[in-house]
Every structure is written in C-alpha cells, then in structure tokens.
C-alpha cells in the first residue's frame, strides 16, 4: 500500500463574507489508522477547527459521510464566513498512539482570504469630440475588489489595445482595492459605430470577466465634405443647384444659401441619409431665378457643423442662352 499523502488542492481560497467556504482535503491511503483533524495555523497556538470524534463545531459540516467505510475525503464546509475566519487551514492526519494519537502528516495548507468582486467597470470618454487621426483618452474605473491582483484589458472593436496605463490603489495592504486605467485611442473616420471595451478579470469572477463599454460616437466628430453642383437642365427661368454635404457626424448641422453674398431666407428642399458607417449625408437643392439679361450669379452653400467654424463652397453660375457649364471654387 502506498505511503499516505495529504492532498489540499487549493493554495488559496477566496470567500465572501456571509457565504460558505469549502476546504478540500483527501488522503491517498487508509493506513495508518487515525483521525484527520482540521486546524487553522501551525505550532502550539494553532486553533482546532474540526474534530469529528469530539467537540462542538456548529458552523462546520463534512462534505462526505465520514462514517462510510473507506472514506478518503475529509473536506469540510464552514458556514457564515466572517473576516475573523481568514488564515491558513491544515488538514492533519494523526496515527494511533498511546496514550494519545500522534500527529503523522499535515496537508500543505489552504489559505482562506476574503474576496470581494470588482464593481462593474465604468468607461468615460473625452469631454469634447475630436476629429479622425487624432488621439483620445478613455478612462476605466472599477472599485471594491480583493485581493489586489487584477487584470485589465482594453479592446477596440474586439482588437486588443496596447497603449494604456493602469494603476491599482492603494499599493499597501487594504480591505479593498480600486483600479483606474487610461487608454489612448487613435480615431478612424469610420469609428462612429466603434466601441471601446474595458475588461476586468479577477479571481472572484470565476473566469467570467466584467466589461464596461463606451461608444466612440460620443467622442468623434467627422467633418463634412461639401460639393456644390448645378443641374444641367434648366426649367423655365430657374436653375437647380445642389449642395451635397457628405460623411459628417454628429447629425447637428446648419446649412444656409447665399446669393451674391445675400443670405437667402426662402425654404429649400433637402434630404438627410445615414451611411453604413454611421455618418450622414445632407443634400440641399436651391432654385435660382435667372433671366437672359441677368449677369453672373455666385451661390454659396455654407455649413456649420456641430458648433464648429463654418465651411462653405461657392458656385458661379454663368448663365447664357445656351446654359454654359458651371465652374466652382471653395472658400474656407
């Protein structure tokens, strides 16, 4: 028969206050005969946690039926855990002796520590929007976890990010800890529908990490491109001019038409469409009254996007009987 080994598989057991802790212990042999007792700590001052034969241990139950023959499982459960229960627990095999049993072999011990789950990560983006090709910072915070060891990762659309800095506080011993991480993200023009994810993994989460998200739509401003065109066909004494405002975000936009420098107050037809990438297109039509005697008309489409400086695009109508081709130029 093989020599008896005491197996305590977990080096560390994290428990939550009020819950039940299971301390595992198995033996590999029935011999030598003698009881298995549980202690907290080592040496003369160790505390007896469980002795099946004698004593009263109201919070302790055995996982297996110890009265079953050939039982090799001496695992115990301790209910209603409090902070006072932390420490290292040892299952100890005694062998028969006279007049008292003699300690024969101890398990390696299981350290019981109080574990606390981290709070759901909160991700905050920049206070102001930024245009593509620029870098923005996102912060992620989670609080109240223990022990201190924790893993935090950042993702953008499922791709892991590497440009971030993380701090866990406090640095010394504490009942609970907090984590704060700042990630730097370069914005792409198509990021309106992108997400950044902060993922926190902790031993108390049993392999199921917590995630906090932020939408880049809250952080990005995609400025529009403008194009003003004149429709080739003329309807009576009216020419249709189109201002196409493309690929902008957010939707907040003001468009005004000017005719030879005078802002036109009359209604114009327009449509707003959303692109697959989440940006918008705005098309505005402007009908210009022309006559054969009339000289050049300069039309300006001015766009103010999301409170930024206005941008405009001009179109000079060269109106002849034969309706010459239009030409255009842009002004900031």
């Amino acid at each position: 028969e093989e020599e008896l080994q005491m197996i305590q598989p977990e080096k560390l057991l994290l428990v939550t206050v009020g819950k039940t802790a299971t301390l595992h212990c198995t033996v590999t042999s029935l011999l030598p005969v003698g009881p298995v007792l549980w202690f907290r700590g080592v040496g003369p001052g160790r505390e007896l946690i469980y002795n099946q034969k004698e004593g009263h241990f109201p919070r302790v139950t055995t996982v297996s039926d110890l009265t079953k023959r050939n039982n090799m499982d001496f695992s115990i459960r301790i209910s209603s855990i409090t902070p006072a229960d932390v420490g290292t627990y040892y299952c100890v095999k005694f062998r028969k002796g006279s007049p008292e049993n003699v300690e024969f072999k101890s398990g390696p011990g299981t350290e019981m520590a109080l574990g606390a789950k981290p709070s759901a990560p909160v991700v905050l983006g920049p206070a102001a929007r930024t245009t593509p090709e620029h870098t923005v910072s996102f912060t992620c915070e989670s609080h109240g976890f223990s022990p201190r060891d924790i893993t935090l990762k950042w993702f953008k659309n499922g791709n892991e990010l590497s440009d971030f800095q993380t701090n866990v506080d406090p640095t010394g011993q504490s009942v609970a800890y907090s984590i704060r991480s700042t990630a730097r993200v370069v914005l792409d023009p198509w990021d309106v529908r992108s997400q950044v994810i902060c993922e926190v993994a902790h031993v108390t989460l049993q392999g199921d990490p917590l995630r906090g998200t932020a939408n880049l739509s809250e952080a990005i401003r995609v400025p529009p491109t403008l194009e003003v065109t004149q429709q080739p066909m003329r309807v009576g004494n009216q020419v249709n001019v189109t201002c196409q405002v493309r690929k902008f975000y957010p939707q907040s936009l003001q468009l005004t038409w000017s005719e030879n420098g005078n802002v036109c107050q009359r209604e114009t037809a327009s449509t707003l469409t959303e692109n697959k990438d989440g940006t918008y297109n705005w098309t505005s039509w402007f009908l210009v009254n022309i006559s054969d005697q009339r000289d050049d008309v300069v039309l300006t489409c001015q766009v103010k996007h999301d409170g930024q400086l206005a941008v405009s695009k001009r179109l000079a109508l060269e109106v002849t009987v034969h309706q010459k081709d239009q030409s255009s130029d842009a002004t900031p």
Epitope: L31, P32, P35, Q52, L66, K68
Partner: antibody, heavy 122, light 106 residues
Framework: QVQLQQWGAGLLKPSETLSLTCAVY????????WSWIRQPPGKGLEWIGE???????NFNPSLKSRVTISVDTSKNQFSLKLRSVTAADTAVYYC????????????????WGQGTTVTVSS | SSELTQPPSVSVSPGQTASITCSGD??????VYWYQQKPGQSPVLVIY???RRPAGIPERFAGSASGNTATLTISGTQAMDEADYYC?????????FGGGTKLTVL
C-alpha cells in the same frame, strides 16, 4: 445499557434461505454499524457483513453473493438473509454493534447478541 | 485480503503471565481488538485500540501492537480466564478475525 436480542429459524434444509433479525434495545441506533458474525461448530469467528442506519452495507467477499443485510430504523432492527444454504452454513449466528467512537478508522464489536444456532440438514 | 495468525493454544499456570500473539501485515498501522469467548457464550471485547480496556475488564488484561504483531497479555492469570481468545482488525471495509487461541489454565 444496550442490549441485542436476535431471533430466526434454527433448522433449514439445503437451498433454503436463512433469515435472522436483531433488535436493539436501550441505546442509539443511528451512528453505528451493525454486524453479523457466525461461528461454525468448534471453529473460529467469521464476519458476514454490516449495515448502518442509513443502509450503507459492507460484506465479507466470500459470502457477498448470497447475503442481504437490511435495516428498519423505525423498529431499531436489522436483518440477515443468506440464500441457498448448505451444511457448511451450519453455525451459531451472532449480531453485534460496531463501536462508532473512532470513525473513520473503524472500531471493535463491543455489544453482542445471545447467538442463534442454525442447522442446515436435509 | 489480510490474514491474522494466532497460535491454536497457549497454556499457563495460575498466577503466571500468559501471552497470546497475533500476526498480520502492517498490524502496527491498524487497530487491533481482542475478544474472549467462553464455552456456550457470546464473545466479549476485552481490548480495543491495541491497548485499551473497556469498562469492566480487569486490569490484568493488557494489549500492545507494533510492526506486524499484536500481543494480548494476561498477568496473574486466573482459572476464570480459561477461554478462547480472538484478535480482530479491519482490512479496508472488512472485519478480519484471527483463527483463535485456546488458553488453558493448568
């Protein structure tokens, strides 16, 4: 003071089933294993098997295929059935308590019944 | 499975010390129990846990176990001690008895 009282048929024909019952008086029934032991005439003790209050059983491998041990906790009784008896099963049959003081490493048989003589003869 | 070997008989004069041995594999790692059985009576446990006496058993009964041998010692043997003696241990989940020793008080 715990006492064990046993009874059952004393004379059997070959191939019949031996049936004995043991009642526990004056003590706890749960928390112990309860054994059956036999002693052929002029020979030593042979352990047959045991049962506890929850019905967990263990048997002598040489008899296991023919033995049934059952328990009736409402009456504080346990019973032995030995099938297909032969003359070799002629013996004094004892019921006994296994002291539970030192689980899981088993204890001695500290209380015994008075014994029942069973003879198998055609 | 484990076997326990006892001498078939031991003789002793009254007042002398009788020793009955029981040998078996790794007995020193197991607990050994001793029973006394007088003719026509049920066995009585006289030693448990190698060397401990149940209540009511005279002090002259003593037990020991080490290595592969257990010993029942009866000091100042009396005529009333004449009986069969059986050692017993456990092999896994099975009770194992020795073959028994007839103690004769001359």
């Amino acid at each position: 003071q715990v006492q064990l009282q046993q009874w059952g048929a004393g004379l059997l024909k070959p191939s019949e089933t031996l049936s004995l019952t043991c009642a526990v008086y004056g003590g706890s029934f749960s928390g112990y294993y309860w054994s059956w032991i036999r002693q052929p005439p002029g020979k030593g003790l042979e352990w047959i098997g045991e049962i506890n209050h929850s019905g967990s059983t263990n048997f002598n491998p040489s008899l296991k295929s023919r033995v049934t041990i059952s328990v009736d906790t409402s009456k504080n009784q346990f019973s032995l059935k030995l099938r297909s008896v032969t003359a070799a099963d002629t013996a004094v049959y004892y019921c006994s308590r296994v002291d539970s003081g030192s689980y899981p490493y088993y204890d001695g048989l500290d209380v015994w019944g008075q014994g029942t003589t069973v003879t198998v003869s055609s | 499975s484990s076997e326990l070997t006892q001498p078939p008989s031991v003789s002793v004069s009254p007042g002398q010390t009788a020793s009955i041995t029981c040998s078996g594999d790794k007995l020193g790692d197991k607990y050994v129990y001793w029973y006394q059985q007088k003719p026509g009576q049920s066995p009585v446990l006289v030693i448990y846990h190698d060397d401990r006496r149940p209540a009511g058993i005279p002090e002259r009964f003593a037990g020991s176990a080490s290595g592969n041998t257990a010993t029942l010692t009866i000091s100042g043997t009396q005529a009333m001690d004449e009986a069969d003696y059986y050692c017993q241990t456990w092999d896994s989940s099975t009770v194992v008895f020795g073959g028994g020793t007839k103690l004769t008080v001359l």
